[in-house]
Interface confidence: medium
Amino acid sequence: MASLSRPSLPSCLCSFLLLLLLQVSSSYAGQFRVIGPRHPIRALVGDEVELPCRISPGKNATGMEVGWYRPPFSRVVHLYRNGKDQDGDQAPEYRGRTELLKDAIGEGKVTLRIRNVRFSDEGGFTCFFRDHSYQEEAAMELKVEDPFYWVSPGVLVLLAVLPVLLLQITVGLIFLCLQYRLRGKLRAEIENLHRTFDPHFLRVPCWKITLFVIVPVLGPLVALIICYNWLHRRLAGQFLEELRNPF
């Protein structure tokens, strides 16, 4: 029967305090997980990319410390603390290139935007949320691709030269056709005049073939190779400029 009796005031108070303590401690004891994209995020060099991150269950993260760091040696990519972006803590290679999108921070969702993506941005990033002394994090991966990755020099040259080559062949054939026609007419006239015909007289000189056929083919070819190399150097330059600054 005792179990059905009304509890005394002190035990009632103890139960209430215990429940209150559990409620308070639960808000610090790790009731959220950090969730990032499960699959690698892809970006092109020079573009911007967004790395989303959220806490589950969703709750207001405005008062939390939110950030991204990356190995090796936890260089800070972006840090948000005390309601402000902490630019001073950023690794030099990310200064001025990152922005934390906080539109949905009230629901525990944030997104890191990285501008002017470089080859060196490829790899792992870790997003974290810190609420007082409790911290959870999630790892994500960024894959950086060359916008011209499908265009090997060979493919580029083939794609660009093929139409030019076809055009040159067509022009060459028309040119030869006209030559033969002209030669035929002249031969008739010469024969009519009873002059000896020199078969070498109307042969197209080698320098003409070089000038009108080979140069227009090689010209664009060389130009395209130079153009391709320049593009690649320009893109790779973004990587090389900081290749030796691993932190």
């Epitope: 040696f73 936890s74 030796r244 691993p246």
Partner: antibody, heavy 122, light 110 residues
């Protein structure tokens, strides 16, 4: 050519201090992260500390944290390791090493100093 | 910091292939492609043989190759030569800002 020349090793009593130096030449010192790695006699390699190219970030192995300090002077192309409160277990050959790594390759050491022996003994 | 696990010794005859393993955890070897391998002859400074799991620096023979599966990285030396006899160390970045080496493997060319 790239050279890392070390100095400052020797015999020291437990609890005392010692400073190692590593003079770099043949490359742009201020563009590379630098590490200290040690090797106890007859034992394997042990990572000690790293400093970023500009000196703003420093990380240490747990075994030396709070006792050792890594620093650099880019104007003198020199890396330092200040070792305080030395213990017998700190006895080792200490190497400085250049980190040629980056974000996608991680840290790796393409050039090493010749090594300098530190003996902690009473 | 506990070292990565390597076999204490490995041996092989000239011309043979050998593989040295390096086992870690998901916090180091398994978590990053940041594994490198070093060769050390007695009394000498270590020499870089492989970095970023499988990349070979210029000047290193193509007989040396690296790979990784799960928490274990491997160094394979094909066409074993007498000058390959040395100690080999693996190294990996470890989360929470540390770098860790393996205990080392003594390679003997028979």
């Amino acid at each position: 050519q790239v050279q890392l020349v070390q100095s400052g090793g020797g015999v020291v009593q437990p609890g005392r201090s010692l400073r190692l130096s590593c003079a770099a030449s043949g490359f742009t010192f201020s563009s590379y992260a630098m590490h200290w790695v040690r090797q106890a006699p007859g034992k394997g390699l042990e990572w000690v500390a790293v400093i970023s190219y500009d000196g703003s970030n420093k990380y240490y192995a747990d075994s030396v944290k709070g006792r050792f300090t890594i620093s650099r002077d880019n104007s003198k192309n020199t890396l330092y390791l200040q070792m305080n409160s030395l213990r017998a277990e700190d006895t080792a050959v200490y190497y400085c090493a250049r980190d040629a790594g980056g974000d996608s390759s991680g840290p790796y050491f393409d050039y090493w100093g010749q090594g300098t022996l530190v003996t902690v003994s009473s | 910091q506990s070292a990565l696990t390597q076999p204490a010794s490995v041996s092989g005859s000239p011309g043979q292939s050998i593989t040295i393993s390096c086992t870690g955890t998901s916090s180091d070897v398994g978590g990053y492609n940041f594994v490198s391998w070093y060769q050390q002859h007695p009394g000498k400074a270590p020499k870089l043989m492989i970095y970023a799991v499988s990349e070979r620096p210029s000047g290193v023979s193509n007989r040396f190759s690296g790979s990784k599966s799960g928490n274990t990285a491997s160094l394979t030396i094909s066409g074993l030569q007498a000058e390959d006899e040395a100690d080999y160390y693996c190294s990996s970045y470890r989360s929470r800002d540390a770098l860790v080496f393996g205990g080392g493997t003594k390679l003997t060319v028979l």
